[in-house]
Interface confidence: medium
């Protein structure tokens, strides 16, 4: 599955756990896998492409949210999310431009 | 079409029980969340309660909680808000509404209500 | 419990006026506010969700705007049925939480 799809998803189930569930640690368990497929690196121009256009913003959204697991202090989730939202926006629009 | 239809409320004594129901059409009742909120004559919107009919797991205001229970039946895709021990200030309307969480969905956000139901806790 | 505090309680406005409602969240709150209108006797309706996204069939004159813990409605220019009330709600934890409403009135 393209990189693209594969968060695009992530970042919908990641939503409904945390909007709809309350479940952080389910959350957690979404997005992670995700960002260590990002760590990785790319593997093909799509990949390499996704990584340029999402990778700064994708990483910073952990960043924060590696924050929030030690400070337990909700603005540092509150910026994940922000970050996560903009970067799901901004999938959605490429994703229906092209489909 | 999207529908939610609240029954049940009515006229009760302090003390008393009550129970409404939301029944559902129009959507996906068993993957979805559904919540109430009241609305106390002349006041604002005040959240009761919610539940993910998927996994049954509910959240409720303080204010009502160890009082109120919601439930939903998938089978009847109906929720329900059993009320017991009410108290004059739980007269209100009681609206359900559909909880949309995700992104895609246009969430998170109440974006399908009932038409609403009146209680009135009086002696 | 995360407060939201709604300005004005009410206003007069005539039609064609730009109005602004604002709504302060005592703590973050991220993007995930709602705003909703109200008419007497009626259900609440969503207007916009996640700060800024107009709802399907809302009209285009409705917008919501974040700076950090600020939230704005705005109508462009007041339409004879916008006069109602309007809440802001935030979803960002339990519980749920909404503003006092703001009661939009004709001058």
């Known amino acids: 599955i393209l990189w693209h799809e594969q968060w695009h998803e992530g970042l919908e189930e990641a939503s409904r756990l945390y909007f709809g569930d309350r479940n952080v640690k389910g959350m957690f368990e979404i997005l992670e896998p995700l960002h260590a497929m990002l760590e990785r690196g790319p593997q093909t121009l799509k990949e390499t492409s996704f990584s340029q256009a999402y990778g700064r913003e994708l990483t910073e959204a952990y960043e924060w949210s590696q924050r929030y697991k030690t400070s337990a202090v909700v603005m540092d989730l509150d910026r994940a999310w922000d970050i996560y939202y903009h970067v799901f926006q901004k999938i959605s629009r490429h994703h229906h431009h092209h489909h | 079409e999207v529908q939610l239809v609240e029954s049940g409320g009515g006229l009760v004594q302090p003390g008393g029980s009550l129970r409404l129901s939301c029944a559902a059409s129009g959507f996906n009742f068993s993957s979805s969340y559904i919540h109430w909120v009241r609305q106390a004559p002349g006041k604002g919107l005040e959240w009761v309660a919610s539940i993910s009919s998927s996994s049954s797991s509910t959240s409720y205001a303080d204010s009502v909680k160890g009082r109120f229970t919601i439930s939903a039946d998938t089978s009847k895709n109906t929720a329900y808000l059993q009320m017991n021990s009410l108290r004059a200030e739980d007269t209100a309307v009681y609206y359900c509404?559909?909880?949309?969480?995700?992104?895609?969905?246009?969430?998170?956000?109440?974006?399908?209500w009932g038409q609403g139901t009146l209680v009135t806790v009086s002696s | 419990d995360i407060q939201m505090t709604q300005s004005p309680s009410s206003l007069s406005a005539s039609v064609g006026d730009r109005v602004t409602i604002t709504c302060r969240a005592s703590q973050s709150v991220s993007s995930a506010v709602a705003w909703y209108q109200q008419k007497p006797g009626k259900a609440p309706k969503l207007l916009i969700y996640?700060?800024?996204s107009l709802y399907s069939g809302v009209p285009s004159r409705f917008s919501g705007s974040r700076s950090g813990t600020d939230f704005t409605l705005t109508i462009s220019s007041l339409q004879p049925e916008d006069f109602a009330t309007y809440y802001c709600q935030q979803s960002w934890s339990v519980p749920i939480t909404f503003g006092q409403g703001t009661k939009v009135e004709i001058k």
């Open positions: 509404a559909r909880y949309v969480y995700s992104y895609s969905q246009g969430g998170p956000a109440f974006d399908y």
């Open positions: 996640s700060a800024s």
